[in-house]
Amino acid sequence: QEFHFGPCQVKGVVPQKLWEAFWAVKDTMQAQDNITSARLLQQEVLQNVSDAESCYLVHTLLEFYLKTVFKNYHNRTVEVRTLKSFSTLANNFVLIVSQLQPSQENEMFSIRDSAHRRFLLFRRAFKQLDVEAALTKALGEVDILLTWMQKFYKL
């Protein structure tokens, strides 16, 4: 079994390992999230994503988690167990992103653009919150991201 984000295949990443890393810090992260009325990875970001679109979307989302979320949270936390869990997630996200090569062909532009618009909906919601709250919420929503990604884990 492996991830199939449309035409983009990802080998060597097992969802169970991602879930185990997240579950280790889930309660801590979600307890720290004080803004329960808002969601970053809202339904409209992830629903009805076509297979072709999924490669672009997962690429932009995971890159954002790596460059903005994990990177900034790493500088803010000292709890060893939390750091270890997020390092596991980050390393696996790096492995996934490194294997994703979304097509840059012109005929794919409408699919690519739609994925970027979905991503912007997420990023704009993230940027509207203050940094601390946004990071906490994004980390607490890794389960939403993993649940969506798991749909693309196939034989």
Epitope: Q42, Q43, E44, H116, R117, R118, L120, L121, R124, K127
Partner: antibody, heavy 118, light 109 residues
Framework: EVQVQESGPGLVKPSQTLSLTCTVS??????????WSWIRQPPGKGLEWMGV???????YYSPSLKSRTSISRDTSKNQFSLQLSSVTPEDTAVYYC??????????WGQGTQVTVSS | QAVVTQEPSLSVSPGGTVTLTCGLS?????????PGWFQQTPGQAPRTLIY???SRHSGVPSRFSGSISGNKAALTITGAQPEDEADYYC?????????FGGGTHLTVL
């Protein structure tokens, strides 16, 4: 191809609320992942982004106008609207609505002139 | 609020090549800012040329191209035509909002 058209009063009195509507044809405002923007251009000056309503109905505004701006949509009429409160003569401008490509306007309306004067 | 900078004016000879740039006051411009470029002639509504750094809007001639050059977004016109004389604006996404630059007036002479 999608087309957008602005409408509303051409003259508004100071301290009142400016209300403009953008009517969309050639496609539904709820189809796809598109966002819908308002931009304005004071006479002889550059473009100023005012705000956007995303496909899920969430809204985002320019920090400098946030306290006075509201964007909403009426999906049954395939329209989205701009309200700008407490207007002054500095709000005199051509107001444009647009459908976004990605994070920036793609298809623009012809614009509607709004003058703020008593 | 972020400030987006553009050259106030530039000129190019017909058939020549010109590059317009778009910078951010506080940081480098990257593809994550989704740079867009717009052309406006007097009395007309703006027209979208480029969005998402490099994507040409439908119907835009291939002589217009977008890129990131150094720490700025860039619009290059290769083989400028007399009808390219206009004001050019860039726009950058700054997270939860968008900002336009002050515009560049391009003269073709």
């Amino acid at each position: 191809e999608v087309q957008v058209q602005e409408s509303g009063p051409g003259l508004v009195k100071p301290s009142q609320t400016l209300s403009l509507t953008c009517t969309v044809s050639g496609g539904s405002i709820t189809t796809g992942t598109y966002s819908w923007s308002w931009i304005r251009q004071p006479p002889g000056k550059g473009l100023e982004w005012m705000g956007v309503i995303a496909y899920d109905g969430s809204t985002y505004y320019s920090p400098s106008l946030k306290s006075r701006t509201s964007i909403s949509r009426d999906t049954s009429k395939n329209q989205f609207s701009l309200q700008l409160s407490s207007v002054t003569p500095e709000d005199t401008a051509v107001y444009y609505c647009a459908r976004d490509d990605v994070a920036a306007p793609g298809y623009w309306g012809q614009g509607t002139q709004v003058t703020v004067s008593s | 609020q972020a400030v987006v900078t553009q050259e106030p004016s530039l000129s190019v000879s017909p058939g020549g090549t010109v590059t317009l740039t778009c910078g951010l006051s506080s940081e480098s411009v990257t593809t994550s800012n989704y740079p867009g470029w717009f052309q406006q002639t007097p009395g007309q509504a703006p027209r979208t040329l480029i969005y998402s750094t490099i994507s040409r809007h439908s119907g835009v001639p291939s002589r217009f191209s977008g890129s990131i050059s150094g720490n700025k977004a860039a619009l290059t016109i290769t083989g400028a035509q007399p009808e390219d004389e206009a004001d050019y604006y860039c726009a950058l996404d700054i997270g939860s909002y968008t900002v336009f630059g002050g515009g560049t007036h391009l003269t073709v002479l």
